[in-house]
């Protein structure tokens, strides 16, 4: 290299990461194998679970505002789960990103998109529940499935917008031991006149903004919404509905537990720019907490099922339908079985939040599956007496 050739500028913390060399330690090898196995399993589970949740909630349940929130959460988790196999491959080839810079940017962006989308959607769920209790008349008039989808669309747009810097500043960096990192390179675009200042300010801005926007603000909204609901229901002398509260509480708790450590280490990493002593702690901890954040997408579907008995019932029914469709005669399939069901109007008033965990009667058998395959998955099943009763209440 000529004396005047300026090397690719890297922030000190990133350059030091590029200098870290792999160990051939046997115990570390076992940990690597276990990590590959664990992430591989999580990839498979995440894809299957979220796929099933999307099918069950989107196709086997009556569309309500609540099912809309869950649908979008599951979609976000499915995206994250779809990126997990590539992270597993990264681990399997010895912690080296062999899939190119563009895919490095895309893969990382999915992780951050899921982070923002999850935070925003959980905030929306809490605000929605709060509005139902605090402004019941307004909620009665304005809470529609169409409105919920529009809100989700706005939230997705905001999540994409917040993900842009992570796409822009993601890069592949060659380590001195030959491995390739897929990591932040905040000097990638317009490094400015002083690299040290740019490194410190940009890394801090990224860490603090994601902590605030994707974690602290959503949790503050969730906490204040919960407090407002609890106060209002106490004044009314009513017990709050159990099931939906349990579902939201479980999902929020999982979100806080899975993403909390990630944000702590992300903030520590920003501090490590000025305090090199923190770097080893960050290097050791970040891979673990990043995986924990990924696993949130695998945990959520389990929580939906565990906190919602009806979800499990519908899940069993759906799986039986799939088996029946494999065994059924072609003649029995006849004309698409979706004719006896009507599609839910996009502006139809939604049921209470309990509708997600209610038990509407619905058509069974292969006709239902074929109807779904032919594109009428949003068709509304016949509403059972319990669901009708629940629909008339406001939680």
């Amino acid at each position: 290299m000529s004396a005047n050739a300026t090397l690719k500028p890297l922030c000190p913390i990133l350059e030091q990461m590029s200098r870290l060399q792999s160990h051939s330690n046997t115990s570390i090898r076992y940990i690597d194998h276990a990590a590959v196995l664990l992430h591989g399993l999580a990839s498979l589970l995440g894809l299957v679970e979220n796929g099933v949740i999307l099918f069950v909630v989107g196709c086997r349940m009556r569309q309500t505002v609540v099912t809309t929130w869950v649908l979008h959460l599951a979609l976000s988790d499915l995206l994250a789960s779809a990126s997990l196999p590539f992270f597993t491959y990264f681990l399997a080839v010895g912690h080296s990103w062999e899939l190119g810079t563009t895919f490095c940017k895309l893969h990382s962006s999915i992780f951050f998109l899921n982070m923002f989308a999850s935070g925003f959607l959980l905030s929306a769920i809490s605000l929605d529940r709060c509005l139902q209790v605090v402004r019941p008349v307004w909620a009665q008039n304005h809470r529609t499935v169409a409105a919920a989808h529009k809100v989700c669309l706005v939230l997705w747009a905001l999540a994409v917008l917040n993900t842009v810097p992570y796409f822009v500043f993601r890069d592949t960096i060659s380590r001195l031991d030959g491995r390739i990192m897929c990591y932040y390179n905040v000097l990638l675009l317009n490094p400015g006149p002083d690299r040290d200042a740019t490194c410190n300010s940009r890394q801090a801005a990224l860490a603090v903004s994601k902590f605030l926007l994707a974690f602290l603000v959503p949790l503050a909204i969730i906490a204040s919404s919960h407090a407002a609901v609890s106060l209002r229901l106490q004044h009314r002398g009513r017990r709050r509905p159990g099931r939906f509260v349990r579902l939201v509480a479980a999902v929020v708790a999982a979100f806080a537990l899975c993403w909390g450590p990630y944000h702590v280490f992300s903030l520590l990493e920003a501090r490590a720019h000025a305090n090199p002593g923190l770097r080893p702690l960050v290097w050791r901890g970040l891979p673990f907490v990043t995986s924990l954040a990924f696993f949130n997408s695998v945990a959520n579907p389990v929580l939906y099922v565990l906190t919602c008995p009806d979800m499990l019932r519908k899940l069993r029914r759906s799986l039986r339908t799939v088996l029946e469709s494999v065994l059924v005669d072609d003649s029995e399939l006849g004309g698409a079985g979706s004719s006896r069901r009507r599609r839910t109007s996009s502006t139809a008033r939604s049921a209470s939040p309990l509708a997600l965990c209610s038990r509407p009667e619905e058509p069974r058998g292969p006709a239902r599956l074929l109807g779904w395959l032919l594109g009428s998955c949003a068709a509304s099943p016949q509403t059972g007496p319990l669901n009708r009763a629940l629909s008339s209440t406001s939680s």
């Epitope: 004396a3 300026t6 000190p12 870290l20 001195l176 002083d194 690299r195 040290d196």
Partner: antibody, heavy 118, light 107 residues
């Protein structure tokens, strides 16, 4: 060809001040971090100061902190070391050095001798 | 501050000999180590950076190795121009300290 030429050294009394300069050429000066390193006669090397490429960040070891100030003028391709409250133990050959990236001094000047004596 | 201890402080060797100089840090420096060669009356010259990487224009008979706190500079076959003083320096946490030097002399 990369060239670093130090100047400003000489004899100074204890408690006195001196300003060293390092003229850089043959490379894009504003793209590189720079440092000053000194070597007492017959002794080893000691890192004295470091400055970021834009001049916003500086670092010093405890032995010189508060007495020495590193600065740079990117328009003049020049690095400076302002030395105040000089002591006998500051007597050394002072080298300016270019950082390869964030560390590692890949090019050094020929050095300038600073003698602190009464 | 991190202390860098070089050994030996001096050694006598013949042309063609294999020479090994070690540098021990008082704490883990994560491969953030450089080796310099200095000849009398001259400025130091970078030989190895990041513990294992050979600097531009440095002959392949020089090599760096090590990890954690222990690092080594090896000259596989000593040449007449290699007789000099060698210094290690860490770049982990400031202040960036040097080893006291190892003088390689002709036997």
């Amino acid at each position: 060809e990369v060239q670093l030429v130090e100047s400003g050294g000489g004899l100074v009394q204890p408690g006195g001040s001196l300003r060293l300069s390092c003229a850089a050429s043959g490379f894009t000066f504003s793209s590189y971090l720079m440092s000053w390193v000194r070597q007492a006669p017959g002794k080893g090397l000691e890192w004295v100061a470091r400055i970021s490429n834009g001049g916003s960040t500086t670092d010093y070891p405890g032995t010189v902190e508060g007495r020495f100030t590193i600065s740079r003028d990117n328009s003049k391709n020049t690095l400076y070391l302002q030395m105040n409250s000089l002591r006998a133990e500051d007597t050394a050959v002072y080298y300016c050095a270019r950082h390869r990236t964030n560390w590692d001094f890949d090019y050094w000047g020929q050095g300038t001798l600073v003698t602190v004596s009464s | 501050d991190i202390q860098m201890t070089q050994s030996p402080s001096s050694l006598s060797a013949s042309v063609g000999d294999r020479v090994t100089i070690t540098c021990r840090a008082s704490e883990n420096i994560y491969w953030n180590l450089a080796w310099y060669q200095q000849k009398p009356g001259k400025a130091p010259k970078l030989v190895v950076y990041a513990a294992t990487q050979l600097a531009d224009g440095v002959p392949s008979r020089f090599s760096g190795s090590g990890s954690g706190t222990d690092y080594t500079l090896t000259i596989s076959s000593l040449q007449p121009e290699d007789f000099a003083t060698y210094y290690c320096q860490h770049f982990w946490i400031t202040p960036w300290t040097f080893g006291q030097g190892t003088k390689v002399e002709i036997k």
